[in-house]
Interface confidence: medium
Amino acid sequence: DAHKSEVAHRFKDLGEENFKALVLIAFAQYLQQCPFEDHVKLVNEVTEFAKTCVADESAENCDKSLHTLFGDKLCTVATLRETYGEMADCCAKQEPERNECFLQHKDDNPNLPRLVRPEVDVMCTAFHDNEETFLKKYLYEIARRHPYFYAPELLFFAKRYKAAFTECCQAADKAACLLPKLDELRDEGKASSAKQRLKCASLQKFGERAFKAWAVARLSQRFPKAEFAEVSKLVTDLTKVHTECCHGDLLECADDRADLAKYICENQDSISSKLKECCEKPLLEKSHCIAEVENDEMPADLPSLAADFVESKDVCKNYAEAKDVFLGMFLYEYARRHPDYSVVLLLRLAKTYETTLEKCCAAADPHECYAKVFDEFKPLVEEPQNLIKQNCELFEQLGEYKFQNALLVRYTKKVPQVSTPTLVEVSRNLGKVGSKCCKHPEAKRMPCAEDYLSVVLNQLCVLHEKTPVSDRVTKCCTESLVNRRPCFSALEVDETYVPKEFNAETFTFHADICTLSEKERQIKKQTALVELVKHKPKATKEQLKAVMDDFAAFVEKCCKADDKETCFAEEGKKLVAASQAALGL
């Protein structure tokens, strides 16, 4: 349904508040280095223009596409060349190439200062003085640091952020009320950003078909009572929403997401029995709730799949007539029966089935050829089951911090060329799988663990893509989306790696470590551990443990000393010498 003015259409659909917030997010995700005030000015100009189009859709420029309008606005930034370098060349292009150019310059690891949380009283004063600016600043700071954050979901986070300040700034103990809420929002926000980053990578690097396959599997697990046609409709709509958001079309994305939530709630009887509570909530909460809703119960007495997908004489005929529909039905039928499998495992099974049909439907006796296809599934199912069992046992034995350290050593030996901050960040996140998933009963462990690992390994892939240093990482990241985790799991120690030169400065510590939070102190120690492995990749677990224990004792001793700085200087030299001796450096 074509509209005379797209900008007027979206302004009317979304309302002024959401329109302004989404334009701010879009601009901050594109121009990540621009000051807040510059973005606010651009947003206000766009909003005023949109209002003129609402008043008269035939007014000058109102018929232009949103990409044209927003791109033109971004290209008015005076400091574009100085701040962004070659990104300024995007402005010489025409749409749609200009928008593609902006997208390619999004930076997953922008050089921005860490967000430091001010004192609670300072934050509450700022909130009361100018609530609107305070919330806009939150959107801006999150969006520029997470250029693929799911925009309509960021509006939901902002709503919760506002609610936290509204409640807690009136509380007797503001800090006790506010800080846990902000910690929760920060952790959930990081997780949400990483999950969305995988969706965008799936669409951008592997195409719409890969994303749709993921969506069929996940929605079939979540809505096992829904018919295949219903699931297919939801998949098509969801793909459109995420394609738009990943492509920077945030107004369309938010609008379409609202329409999808409306459709799901109007048709919940034919989708899932678990949607009732979600559908009673306001829009932002409703969409979030639907996205997180628990799996519905599987229908009773589902027939075996063998009849339709192996025993039937029409398998090759049905496959040839509509390959993707037939494979989609296979994935749907398999996924709805297996909420206990990870989505990536289901996709591996579907890929194996597809490969078998491609081969067998061209054979002399197709049925004889594919009759044993499901025997090929057994090892694919058992591999993640065994891996999760082993790693959960290790996690329960070591606890989170030491489990992270074991993974740090494992991954540094696999891909020692990767930067130390990236190895620390990724391994810490990989290690969180233990506390996140090992507490679950076995039926929920695999979907929790393997699908979470897919999200974390995607972080490694997008950070590595910015500055590629390892052919092994590139290979695991680009060959197959669903086999990334098995690919990394299969990597052994990189025998071609030339150990890093020893640099005492890397292992020199100062009294400032004593004032760090427990988390920051862990990161310092884990950074040292990665550097140790890079210097001595053949070091045994026992050697590394001994050095790390000595290091922990050294930090504890010097933090208790009267003259901390002298202690760090003198004891630090001894520690470096002892470590070199222990590791044969």
């Epitope: 799949l305 029966r337 039926a443």
Partner: nanobody, 116 residues
Framework: QVQLVESGGGLVQPGGSLRLSCAAS????????LAWYRQAPGKQRDLVAR???????HYADSVKGRFTVSRDNAENTLVLQMNSLKPEDTAVYYC??????????WGQGTQVTVSS
């Protein structure tokens, strides 16, 4: 295929307890739902309780609050803990496995008799 063997049946007094076990072997990796059914003499076979691969459970109204179904995927076993047994619980209890790939499988059955 999946093979099932039940154990734990026997004679018990009203108000007593029994624990039925079902050991699965063969292509257990393909099982999604496990269930207990029962058949009293001259009656049809009825669902008692089932548990899906996602861990969700369903009970017949007549046993709710008295029977508990659980599964151990690592050991490939299904358990039915039966408390506060009544004479009307007397039946042959069958283990049932619904598999993704194979036709449904049934055990041979184990007799439970509740009588004073």
């Amino acid at each position: 295929q999946v093979q099932l063997v039940e154990s734990g049946g026997g004679l018990v007094q009203p108000g007593g307890s029994l624990r039925l076990s079902c050991a699965a072997s063969g292509s257990t990796w393909s099982i999604n739902t496990l269930a207990w059914y029962r058949q009293a003499p001259g009656k049809q076979r009825d669902l008692v309780a089932r548990i899906s691969s996602g861990g969700s459970t369903h009970y017949a109204d007549s046993v709710k609050g008295r029977f508990t179904v659980s599964r151990d995927n690592a050991e490939n076993t299904l358990v039915l803990q039966m408390n506060s047994l009544k004479p009307e619980d007397t039946a042959v209890y069958y283990c049932y496995a619904q598999s993704t790939w194979y036709p449904p499988s049934w055990g041979q059955g184990t007799q439970v008799t509740v009588s004073s």
